[in-house]
Interface confidence: low
């Protein structure tokens, strides 16, 4: 059945509406639109003849209508007068007529509303307020919003005058909110600006802060008073009943025991005419002593000594507190507190136990902190390090070696060459060295306080000829597309150039190849199977050169997607089925077969003699590389015909 659907049904002035035609018959001669519920030539809007594709305006055509080939009618720039029924008259090719009627309604766009009020400053628990939404508009719905929420259910809220008036009875301070009204019709909705209701209230009973009532002699007393009130309250202070000042805050510097007593705050609201008071009792105490820390060992030795720190003075019924590095004590089996918490013992001190340490005495009012104490922990020396790290030098250069070992107090250093003492300095300098300066160079570090000493030995070779280098690697079996490998050319030698070759060629240009550490280190990022080549490093200076033995990179890869051969998928009954599976992989993968999902043998070749149609199905080869942890598979369908 031919039907007309209005999209939308409710249209705003100035917008557009589409009269959408459903179930338009086929084989049409043409169609025509009319204003109203019947076909009336005087009210024809537009006609359309399909054969000529000609649209002809009628008496009711306004220039705002567009007829679509599917007979739908679009009316633009809608006016109020467009409201009503529209009839489509369809003439079929056999000249049989069919009609359908649709309708829509036109509504004006609403203006922005505003709120008027009968009382701008109502008093809490006394006054009522009536808000009215302006203007009064025909066919409009009125809504109200409080703080952008719909109206709460309350016996004190009443809507009247077609919801246009909102009355709040017996206002409270909680009614101080943002009020908006909204007007709606089927095509538009407009909200007013906010109106803030200003409810006069209070003062409530004032609160005095801070809440603490105990103070120490010599402190400043700073009391603040606050009472909920609109407009804000005026404040007065009384001490032991005597008026002091008309301020919100009361400040008395450097108080004494004589300042103990009752402190009263009075709050007054000039608009409501109400007064409220609150009293607090302040007690001032005398000053206790400042604590300090004593130690039984001012220079403990690392990993040997224990240290007992004691908080002085000893006061009965007092709580003692400790801090390390401005933090409360960490949980540690090396930290022990005495029963009264006055003594902190550090068992087997380390260099990290230097502190600072603070103790505190807690009384009714506060915590008194001691001055910080720092421990002088004797440690070391650790194993010395000799720099620079070169082991090969050319004749004629200067040899300058430096030694360092972590130690407290700082270590004393001695140098030995081939076991013979040279000098007692941190640095060793020999100018214009020769081959005779080759040997074992020993640095000895000594801590005079702990009596400990440690040594490090370095072999120095002075030679015009460079040694044969070797390649060290950080990963002997890298996995393809996952691992990186760093090759380093040994040894590290002064004034030496490092070179690299791959398969006898100089390094190719590749974003995956990176030289660092003065070309001494070659890094291959994201290795591939093609990187499994012979790598050689070379060193050279102005008088000699040498190359390492080749190192072949063993890249683990695969398994790739396997291939089943032969490729045939159709077999005759009685033939032998001999399938071979192969997958590129390093190391070689493990093979297994499944027929129709059922596991078979763990071999590379699957052999079935004298196959029958029962052997039809899917043959899957699974490959697994235990070294890379990767798996792969392929499925092949086999058809056996009788």
């Amino acid at each position: 059945k031919l039907t007309i659907e209005s999209t939308p049904f409710n249209v705003a002035e100035g917008k557009e509406v589409l009269l959408l035609v459903h179930n338009l018959p086929q084989h049409l001669f043409g169609y025509s639109w009319y204003k109203g519920e019947r076909v009336d030539g005087n009210r024809q809007i537009i006609g359309y003849v399909i054969g000529t594709q000609q649209a002809t305006p009628g008496p009711a055509y306004s220039g705002r209508e567009i007829i679509y080939p599917n007979a739908s009618l679009l009316i633009q720039n809608i006016i109020q007068n467009d409201t009503g029924f529209y009839t489509l008259h369809v003439i079929k090719s056999d000249l049989v007529n069919e009609e359908a009627t649709g309708q829509f309604r036109v509504y004006p766009e609403l203006p922005k509303p505003s709120i008027s009020s009968n009382n701008s400053k109502p008093v809490e628990d006394k006054d009522a307020v009536a808000f009215t939404c302006e203007p009064e508009t025909q066919d409009a719905t009125y809504l109200w919003w409080v703080n952008n929420q719909s109206l709460p259910v309350s016996p004190r809220l009443q809507l009247s005058n077609g919801n246009r008036t909102l009355t709040l009875f017996n206002v409270t301070r909680n009614d101080t909110a943002s009020y908006k009204c909204e007007t709606q019709n089927p095509v538009s909705a407009r909200r007013s600006d906010s109106v803030i209701l200003n409810v006069l209230y209070g003062p409530d009973a004032p609160t005095i802060s801070p809440l603490n009532t105990s103070y120490r002699s010599g402190e400043n007393l700073n009391l603040s008073c606050h009472a909920a009130s609109n407009p804000p309250a005026q404040y007065s202070w009384f001490v032991n009943g005597t008026f002091q000042q008309s301020t919100q805050e009361l400040f008395i510097p450097n108080i004494t025991v004589n300042n103990s007593g009752s402190y009263t705050c009075q709050a007054h609201n000039s608009d409501t005419g109400l007064n409220r008071t609150t009293v607090t009792t302040i007690t001032v105490y005398a000053e206790p002593p400042k604590p300090f820390i004593t130690s039984n060992n001012s220079n403990p030795v690392e990993d040997e000594d224990a240290v007992a720190l004691t908080c002085e003075p000893e006061i009965q019924n007092t709580t003692y507190l400790w801090w390390v590095n401005n933090q409360s004590l960490p949980v540690s089996p090396r930290l022990q507190l005495s029963n009264d918490n006055r003594t902190l013992t550090l068992l087997s001190v380390t260099r990290n136990d230097v502190g600072p340490y603070e103790c505190g005495i807690q009384n009714e009012l506060s915590v008194d902190h001691s001055d910080p104490v720092i421990l002088n922990v004797l440690y070391g020396p650790d194993d010395p390090t000799i720099s620079p790290s070169y082991t090969y030098y050319r004749p004629g250069v200067n040899l300058s070696l430096s030694c360092h070992a972590a130690s407290n107090p700082p270590a004393q250093y001695s140098w030995l060459i081939d076991g013979n003492i040279q000098q007692h300095t941190q640095e060793l300098f020999i100018s214009n060295i020769t081959e005779k300066n080759s040997g074992l160079y020993t640095c000895q570090a000594n801590n005079s306080a702990s009596g400990h000493s440690r040594t490090t030995v370095k072999t120095i070779t002075v030679s015009a000829e460079l040694p044969k280098p070797s390649i060290s690697s950080n990963n002997s079996k890298p996995v393809e597309d996952k691992d990186a490998v760093a090759f380093t050319c040994e040894p590290e030698a002064q004034n030496t150039t490092y070179l690299w070759w791959v398969n006898g060629q100089s390094l190719p240009v590749s974003p995956r190849l990176q030289l660092s550490n003065g070309n001494r280190t070659l890094t291959l990022f994201n290795v591939t199977r093609n990187d499994a080549r012979a790598y050689v490093c070379g060193i050279q200076n102005s008088v000699s050169a040498n190359r390492s033995d080749p190192v072949t990179l063993d890249v683990l890869y695969g398994p790739d997607t396997p291939i089943i051969s032969p490729p045939d998928s159709s077999y005759l009954s009685g033939a032998n089925l001999n399938l071979s599976c192969h997958s590129a992989s390093n190391p070689s993968p493990q093979y297994s077969w499944r027929i129709n999902g059922i596991p078979q043998q763990h071999t590379q070749v699957l052999f079935i003699a004298k196959i029958t149609p029962n052997n039809n199905g899917t043959y899957a080869c699974f490959v697994s590389n235990l070294a890379t942890g990767r798996n792969n598979s392929i499925v092949k369908s086999i058809t056996v015909s009788a």
Partner: antibody, heavy 121, light 111 residues
Framework: QVQLVQSGAEVKKPGSSVKVSCKAS????????MHWVRQAPGQGLEWMGR????????KYVPKFQGRVTITADTSTSTAYMELSSLRSEDTAVYYC??????????????WGQGTLVTVSS | EIVLTQSPATLSLSPGERATLSCRAG??????????LHWYQQKPGQAPRLLIY???NRATGIPARFSGSGSGTDFTLTISSLEPEDFAVYYC?????????FGQGTKLEIK
């Protein structure tokens, strides 16, 4: 602002029915059509049908004709889609979406959060 | 019903590249030269999001890098410079006639 809140996930047995709700706010559902679209796991979007809440007229894809019923309650601004004779292939996320000149300019500009219906024995 | 065919099914690109997605209708979806063809973006676990309506109009809040073109039966969605958050599934939909059909979707994935 426009909001569409759908009912929670459902687990149903084959042969039973499910009714999914879609509560609209921020617009008048009478001014739009409410459409229902579903999406099976890992599949594309499939239009099921629509209703004009102003008059209750509904239209369904022939595939669902006889099994699906789309209704609307304008007093609560809620649209419903009921699918009967459920089968395992009806397991999908079902979405509601308004469609019309005022809300979405003849496209589906707003969607519900979706309701997962699982059909399993 | 009008069948919509999207191509490609999957598009692998890198951030910063230009993406071109195609939607072809089995018959014209135009009404007086305006294509009632829309584009949506969908991310896993989320409802579809309207990007382009009626062929070439950007929906509210959609960045300018998204644009639509075409009329009749051939439509294109273009993303001028891909951002990481643009990798998702994209659907076209026609609302020219019932049933309102969707394309099968194009998955835009990171290369």
């Amino acid at each position: 602002q426009v909001q569409l809140v759908q009912s929670g996930a459902e687990v149903k047995k084959p042969g039973s029915s499910v009714k999914v709700s879609c509560k609209a706010s921020g617009f008048n559902i009478k001014d739009t059509y409410m459409h229902w679209v579903r999406q099976a796991p890992g599949q594309g979007l499939e239009w099921m049908g629509r209703i004009d809440p102003a008059n209750g007229n509904s239209k369904y894809v022939p595939k669902f004709q006889g099994r699906v019923t789309i209704t609307a309650d304008t007093s609560t601004s809620t649209a419903y889609m009921e699918l009967s004779s459920l089968r395992s292939e009806d397991t999908a996320v079902y979405y509601c979406a308004p469609f019309g000149y005022y809300v979405s300019d003849y496209a589906m500009a707003y969607w519900g959060q979706g309701t997962l219906v699982t059909v399993s024995s | 019903e009008i069948v919509l065919t999207q191509s490609p099914a999957t598009l692998s690109l890198s951030p910063g590249e230009r993406a071109t997605l195609s939607c072809r209708a089995g018959e014209s979806v135009d009404i007086f030269g305006v294509g009632f063809l829309h584009w949506y973006q969908q991310k896993p676990g989320q409802a579809p999001r309207l990007l382009i309506y009626r062929g070439s109009n950007r929906a509210t809040g959609i960045p300018a890098r998204f644009s639509g073109s075409g009329s009749g039966t051939d439509f294109t969605l273009t993303i001028s410079s891909l951002e990481p958050e643009d990798f998702a599934v994209y659907y076209c939909q026609q609302t020219n006639e019932d049933p309102y059909t969707f394309g099968q979707g194009t998955k835009l994935e990171i290369k």
